[in-house]
């Protein structure tokens, strides 16, 4: 790869390391859960709670009043925070794509089934526009099999 390309990647990496993308993840998960609920899924099925503390306590947004709010009261709050974070990537389309890829990777092991994964991916692609930002033209959101390491 070109040297200047790597330099740009480093600056992007610096932003990615500093970004708190959890509100984006929470906003999207709540959105697809609500969509599923409206099709008759039991809204209180514990296995569907992607932020149940027993599953992953350290991924909770510390500013969130509750681990998960299916009714969406906190969702607009999550969306606002999410948009504030994504706004940092507005002028760098490649870096915006990497931020979206990171969100996809972080959530990939919580998405149940191909349908939910596709739905999450669709919502994720629309996220920049929802925030009034430019969406990256080409952005591969496929997650490599094997997922990611968690520590």
């Amino acid at each position: 790869r070109q040297q200047w390309e790597l330099q740009g990647d480093r600056r992007c990496q610096s932003q990615l390391e500093r970004a708190n993308l959890r509100p984006c993840e929470q906003h999207l998960m709540q959105k697809i859960q609500r969509d599923e609920d409206s099709y008759g899924r039991d809204p209180y099925s514990p296995s569907q709670d992607p932020y149940s503390p027993s599953q992953d306590p350290d991924r909770r947004d510390p500013y969130s009043p509750s681990p998960y709010d299916r009714r969406g009261a906190g969702s607009s709050q999550h969306q606002e925070r999410c948009c504030n974070e994504l706004n940092e990537f507005e002028n760098n389309q490649r870096c915006m794509c990497e931020a979206l890829q990171q969100i996809m990777e972080n959530q990939s092991d919580r998405l149940q089934g191909r349908q939910q994964e596709q739905q999450f991916k669709r919502e994720l692609r629309n996220l920049p526009q929802q925030c009034g930002l430019r969406a990256p033209q080409r952005c591969d959101l496929e997650v490599e099999s094997g997922g990611r390491d968690r520590y």
């Epitope: 480093r10 600056r11 990496q13 610096s14 390391e17 002028n91 760098n92 390491d149 520590y151």
Partner: antibody
């Protein structure tokens, strides 16, 4: 010499690893960086050709190997997490004697 | 290049350390200056104080502040405390190599 740096308490792939060295009574000298997710690396010109940075993601461990050592390489070698080096290891002392 | 090499300031007074980069560390696409300030005490690893030239790292007292853009930067310590005696380094991470300044030794007058 191969110096290791074991990460804990965070997602290893998410943050770059920097390597910095410091000779006794001297300033900080940046050696290079590695992205654990992609394996991409970048080295200071001074170390090109004799330094190699690798990682074992399954062990959350980064490695820095420095070859053809001279007494001038005697220093404490630090690994640091993140592009802007937010968290530092305690350092590994490397002594090269003739 | 950092200046001065060493500095003696009275307790409660202000300390100012300068850092000049040979090339601009400002990135227009992110609107950020990729420069950090570190504090190092004897026998300890460095500690990040300021990132992106002016953002205080979490847990760092608010008497520490960073300013500047492009090639000229300043670390200011308001109301110097005894525990601030240390060596301070700037580092640019805009482009490889991520060079450090030579360090400024801060002492109590």
């Amino acid at each position: 010499v191969k110096v290791s740096c074991k990460a804990s308490g965070y997602t290893f792939n998410r943050y770059d690893i920097n390597w910095v060295r410091q000779a006794t009574g001297q300033g900080l000298e940046w050696v290079g960086w590695m992205n654990p997710k992609t394996g991409n690396t970048g080295y200071a010109q001074k170390f090109q050709g004799r330094v190699t940075m690798t990682r074992d993601t399954s062990m959350s461990t980064a490695y820095m190997e420095l070859n053809n050592l001279t007494s001038e390489d005697t220093a404490v070698y630090y690994c640091a997490r993140g592009v802007d080096a937010t968290h530092w290891g305690q350092g590994t002392r490397v002594t090269v004697s003739s | 290049t950092q200046s001065p090499d060493s500095l003696a300031v009275s307790l409660g007074e202000r300390a100012t350390i300068n850092c000049k980069s040979s090339q601009s560390v400002f990135d227009s696409s992110s609107n950020k200056n990729y420069l950090g300030w570190y504090q190092q005490n004897p026998g300890q690893p460095p500690k990040l104080l300021i990132y992106w030239a002016s953002n205080r790292e979490s847990g760092v007292p608010d008497r520490f502040s960073g300013s500047g853009s492009g090639t000229d930067f300043t670390l200011t310590i308001d109301s110097l405390q005894a525990e601030d005696v240390a060596i301070y380094y700037c580092q640019q991470y805009h482009s490889t190599p991520h060079t450090f300044g030579q360090g400024t030794k801060l002492e109590i007058k």
